[in-house]
Interface confidence: medium
């Protein structure tokens, strides 16, 4: 996902709607003017703001990366929603890119969870039911895995 936080823009353009701030803040879909007197609407499809704010600029809309699909477009009050393509996932703790899901579990393990846009397949030991740890196993342990994505043993 590519995004720049504040989007410098030509303010006071004729087509941009203006309203007055409430308690010094502007509503979602707007940013505040430099003199603090006006709320200026964000530009649909270009930038947005999600909450009451005193932002000098609206936030620039995210553009989905290749390998992502756009679930919903950017509006003036909501950023673009991007999701990993089928067969790939993005973890909470590594949100920078979509990674390929593994195609199978290590030997001695069974699949209990499918690949989703936010998680890899889930493998557990046949006997104990212990989840895999994400450590890279010895090559001979691997049953099937995506190229470049070793299967993981359990903890």
């Amino acid at each position: 996902i590519t995004q720049q936080d504040l989007a410098p823009q030509q303010r006071a353009a004729p087509q941009q709607k203006r309203s007055s701030p409430s308690e010094g803040l502007c509503p979602p879909g707007h940013h505040i003017s430099e003199d603090g007197r006006d709320c200026i609407s964000c530009k649909y499809g270009q930038d947005y703001s999600t909450h009451w704010n005193d932002l000098l600029f609206c936030l620039r809309c995210t553009r989905c990366d290749s390998g992502e699909v756009e679930l919903s477009p950017c509006t003036t009050t909501r950023n673009t929603v991007c999701q990993c393509e089928e067969g790939t996932f993005r973890e909470e703790d590594s949100p920078e890119m979509c990674r390929k899901c593994r195609t199978g579990c290590p030997r001695g393990m069974v699949k209990v969870g499918d690949c989703t846009p936010w998680s890899d397949i889930e493998c557990v030991h046949k006997e104990s039911g212990t989840k895999h740890s994400g450590e890279v196993p010895a090559v001979e342990e691997t049953v099937t895995s995506s190229p470049g994505t070793p299967a993981s043993p359990c903890s």
Partner: nanobody, 125 residues
């Protein structure tokens, strides 16, 4: 690694004020979005306010608009939350957060990479 230490919580009567502080160490905060979330007993963690970056502007949840003010002192690597006209429903543990990257605006917990331990604010008479 970033460490965040909140302070300033406590017991206050309805209508009273508190000022929370969050001291960051391990990274300069000046180019990063920071913010405050809170979690009341038995409820989901919710967004309170965010400072986008380098004093570029601030975000506020509807529930605190006009009562809470977020600010930051980049020279002290510290984020503040001035809370006025406190209500019983503001009772919660307040968490300071820092964004994953300079480009991340924090308005959802997903955008926050570093969390403080939290400071308890109790509003009661």
């Amino acid at each position: 690694e970033v460490q965040l230490l909140e302070s300033g919580g406590g017991l206050v009567q309805p209508g009273g004020s508190l000022r929370l502080s969050c001291a960051a160490s391990g990274r300069s905060i000046s180019n990063y979005a920071m913010g405050w979330f809170r979690q009341a007993p038995g409820k989901e963690r919710e967004f309170v306010s965010a400072s986008v970056w380098n004093n570029g502007g601030n975000y506020y949840a509807d529930s605190v608009k006009g009562r809470f003010t977020i600010s930051r002192d980049n020279s002290k690597n510290t984020l503040y939350l001035q809370m006025n006209s406190l209500r019983a429903e503001d009772t919660a543990v307040y968490y300071c957060v820092v964004a994953r990257t300079p480009e991340t605006p924090i308005t959802s917990a997903r955008g926050a990479n570093y969390w403080g331990q939290g400071t308890l604010v109790t509003v009661s008479s």
